[in-house]
Amino acid sequence: MAVTACQGLGFVVSLIGIAGIIAATCMDQWSTQDLYNNPVTAVFNYQGLWRSCVRESSGFTECRGYFTLLGLPAMLQAVRALMIVGIVLGAIGLLVSIFALKCIRIGSMEDSAKANMTLTSGIMFIVSGLCAIAGVSVFANMLVTNFWMSTANMYTGMGGMVQTVQTRYTFGAALFVGWVAGGLTLIGGVMMCIACRGLAPEETNYKAVSYHASGHSVAYKPGGFKASTGFGSNTKNKKIYDGGARTEDEVQSYPSKHDYV
């Protein structure tokens, strides 16, 4: 029961996390114009991974896409790549984990296969979360660096009395969404990995061992408690007891009072 709950919760947490990573990747507010201790302008600038936007005081907003690949900073490209890898891995992980869920029965899929799929999806979620956290952190670091550089050169002289004010950018909402989403995906992945341990069949299936007595060839088959002479058609060790240790969850395959607690 606990395993099913852990697996289900891990799936839901990861699902929310990946939705958050997708949302963060698409959001325009990765960096927003810093309004603190800055000459107040009647326009508000903010930028995303794919386009930059300007909102005028009237509320009129204009966004322009980055229609160049080669002209963009390498760091921005790296962040894009990390976020996309995170989304792709997360999406595959979700797909795999759906089939790995204990509450979903697919044909005669063995528990060992479900355990492997749960582990695979868990690892994928962990990597996906790490990619998102890394991407957002790289962008945040880039912002911090640029912020202090532009603070140092806040007023760039252009000869004579003319000055141009550099627009400083600070953390946008997308960064926080990305960090939280990455963290959730990571937690979800860890939960899936924990659930995998509970799902995996314990290796306690005793192999049939033949003990040959001095006089008679008698095969003792532990578990089946059936003995036969070592001759004739019974010399093959037939699998009488499937030694795969079932978990408490598997034993309760039919509804019991515990299912409704």
Partner: antibody, heavy 120, light 113 residues
Framework: QVQLVQSGAEVKKPGASVKVSCKAS????????IHWVRQAPGQGLEWMGR????????YYNEKFTGRVTMTRDTSTSTVYMELSSLRSEDTAVYYC?????????????WGQGTTVTVSS | DIVMTQSPDSLAVSLGERATINCKSS????????????LTWYQQKPGQPPKLLIY???TRESGVPDRFSGSGSGTDFTLTISSLQAEDVAVYYC?????????FGGGTKLEIK
């Protein structure tokens, strides 16, 4: 059509207050900023501040902070500008103007102006 | 506050001739985000409120004759009337529409020679 109709001329004594009204029509009143700009006789234009009728948010020119108050009445689509502690240099024509949408923060419609004379 | 300096203070031009008014701001009015200059031009005729002519330094307001054009970027801007008409006699103001508080130039009085 968009119209901004202002109240009539006022004559005030120094130290008094004046309240000028600006009634809007022909558009959704709560969706556009209203600015107040004044013009002293034979002088240029001076921006005093603005109010967003939808929320009542205001932004004042620091020169007038503490002396100017902008309010609105959404039921009558009217914006008010009150200037206190009047001085002779406050003698001017006071204009209300609507900020256009997607027009680079420019004022696309103006009231006819209200003449305020401060004299002892 | 941003200082807007207009030149000349007054200008006399013959009918049909080109009139050019300059405006200089103490800080750049160019927004890097959209590469637009937040400078506005107004026309004010005697006894009337100002009228919006040009915004974003070069975009004509609807209904404004195409003989009016704006140019410039950063700190230096120009309003050009390609062929002066009698009804163009007015005072022209440039305005910083980028920084608070909004500030206006001193105005240029345009007359017919």
């Amino acid at each position: 059509q968009v119209q901004l109709v202002q109240s009539g001329a006022e004559v005030k004594k120094p130290g008094a207050s004046v309240k000028v009204s600006c009634k809007a029509s022909g558009y959704i009143f709560t969706n556009y900023w209203i600015h107040w700009v004044r013009q002293a006789p034979g002088q240029g234009l001076e921006w005093m501040g603005r109010i967003y009728p939808g929320t009542g948010n205001t932004y004042y020119n620091e020169k007038f902070t503490g002396r100017v108050t902008m309010t609105r009445d959404t039921s009558t689509s009217t914006v008010y500008m009150e200037l206190s502690s009047l001085r002779s240099e406050d003698t001017a024509v006071y204009y209300c103007a609507r900020e256009g949408y997607g027009k680079g923060n420019s004022m696309d419609y103006w009231g006819q102006g209200t003449t305020v004379t401060v004299s002892s | 506050d941003i200082v807007m300096t207009q030149s000349p203070d007054s200008l006399a031009v013959s009918l049909g001739e080109r009139a050019t008014i300059n405006c200089k701001s103490s800080q750049s009015l160019l927004n890097a985000g959209n590469q637009k200059n937040y400078l506005t031009w107004y026309q004010q005729k005697p006894g009337q409120p100002p009228k919006l002519l040009i915004y974003w330094a070069s975009t004509r307001e609807s209904g404004v004759p195409d003989r009016f054009s704006g140019s410039g970027s950063g700190t230096d801007f120009t309003l050009t009337i390609s062929s002066l008409q009698a009804e163009d006699v007015a005072v022209y103001y440039c305005q910083n529409a980028y920084y608070y508080p909004y500030t206006f130039g001193g105005g240029t009085k345009l007359e017919i020679k």
